[in-house]
Amino acid sequence: VIHVTKEVKEVATLSCGHNVSVEELAQTRIYWQKEKKMVLTMMSGDMNIWPEYKNRTIFDITNNLSIVILALRPSDEGTYECVVLKYEKDAFKREHLAEVTLSVKADFPTPSISDFEIPTSNIRRIICSTSGGFPEPHLSWLENGEELNAINTTVSQDPETELYAVSSKLDFNMTTNHSFMCLIKYGHLRVNQTFNWNTTKQEHFPDN
């Protein structure tokens, strides 16, 4: 099994590892499927691409019967199978079988934290946000290892790319020193950013 790892912004080429001459195409059937769901077929030179892939897939007949997925989505991750059948003695017989496992990385960048003064009060507001990752993120605020209550946390998903964005607000009393960590967990991965507030200098230090 061949393994291909790509990021969502990239293009993935999945090779069948087999070549068919133009002359042989009329007597050949080629199937690309992902976990038993059809991606693309070519029968006697006629190609059909399934709707989920139609807008973003190229069949590269000249390069080992590869499929090229242009706008990768997290849901493209999985095992793809290429089957080549050739007509011999009144029947189509399997000439080639290949499996390619595609991993699609969609990592959240380190979150950014911005802060805002709330007029006529000792309260300051910080906002932690990041976008472009998968799977669904879970954001938490921590201080000295203890979880804090955020004002509101929003998680949104882009329907076309399937990627997530997350944003959360936290209010704190600016008369005391603080060190807040914004922690985002997604799948088995995590990213975080720390925000330090020093009352004596009335300034903050994002921890890069």
Epitope: K9, V11, T62, S131, T161, L163
Partner: antibody
Framework: QVQLQQSGAELVRPGSSVKISCKAS????????MNWVKQRPGQGLEWIGQ????????NYNGKFKGKATLTADKSSSTAYMQLSSLTSEDSAVYFC??????????WGQGTSVTVSS | DIVMTQSQKFMSTSVGDRVSITCKAG??????VAWYQQKPGQSPKTLIY???NRHTGVPDRFTGSGSGTDFTLTISNVQSEDLADYFC?????????FGSGTKLEIK
């Protein structure tokens, strides 16, 4: 609906720099490559390069390396292109265009840059 | 760089006619080709992507075909509003490259 709004026309001196902007709306700005394309009066289209706002990754046409610098601000959903050491050859209309699967599908209205002393 | 050749600089046609604009790639670009229409003073508008797929809202009189090195944009039942420049683009290899354009004139 997807919209790309570009900054207004620029008249600039030779040797100087100019930064033009492209504000995106109607889609998730971070997740699509933004391309920049040059068109000189009465001529064809030239691809300058592209940026992926999600992480700032860029691809440039070798011809424009050192001439164009692409940046993006996710917080305002705005892409920028800075052109430096301007000459009369840089006088053109510049378009931003979003791409999905490498196809530039939606285009800005264009920004005219005139280099003149 | 991959050169995209549009050999017809100008094409003249009449309303109701069928016209084919061609684009030849300097090397195999599979089906990684798009077609754009540009009217005077306007930005390009996407007609066709991946060689044969119509972009959202494009009338079905516009059809794209081809793969490898030879591509065709066909406009059937030409309308007066089709007066414009037509460009092809390859996005198989960096840098992306455009054809020089074909100006469609209405008799």
């Amino acid at each position: 609906q997807v919209q790309l709004q570009q900054s207004g026309a620029e008249l600039v001196r030779p040797g100087s720099s100019v930064k033009i902007s492209c504000k995106a709306s109607g889609y998730a700005f971070s997740y699509y490559w933004m391309n920049w394309v040059k068109q000189r009066p009465g001529q064809g289209l030239e691809w300058i390069g592209q940026i992926y706002p999600g992480d700032g990754d860029t691809n440039y046409n070798g011809k424009f390396k050192g001439k164009a610098t692409l940046t993006a601000d996710k917080s305002s959903s705005t892409a920028y292109m800075q052109l430096s050491s301007l000459t009369s050859e840089d006088s053109a209309v510049y378009f931003c265009a979003r791409s999905y699967g490498n196809t530039m599908d939606y285009w800005g209205q264009g920004t005219s840059v005139t280099v003149s002393s | 760089d991959i050169v995209m050749t549009q050999s017809q600089k100008f094409m003249s046609t009449s309303v109701g006619d069928r016209v084919s604009i061609t684009c030849k790639a300097g090397q195999n670009v599979r089906t990684a080709v798009a077609w754009y229409q540009q009217k005077p003073g306007q930005s390009p508008k996407t007609l066709i992507y991946l060689a044969s797929n119509r972009h959202t809202g494009v009338p079905d009189r516009f059809t794209g075909s081809g793969s490898g090195t030879d591509f065709t944009l066909t406009i059937s039942n030409v309308q007066s509003e089709d007066l414009a420049d037509y460009f092809c683009l390859q996005h198989w290899n960096y840098p992306f490259t455009f054809g020089s354009g074909t100006k469609l004139e209405i008799k």
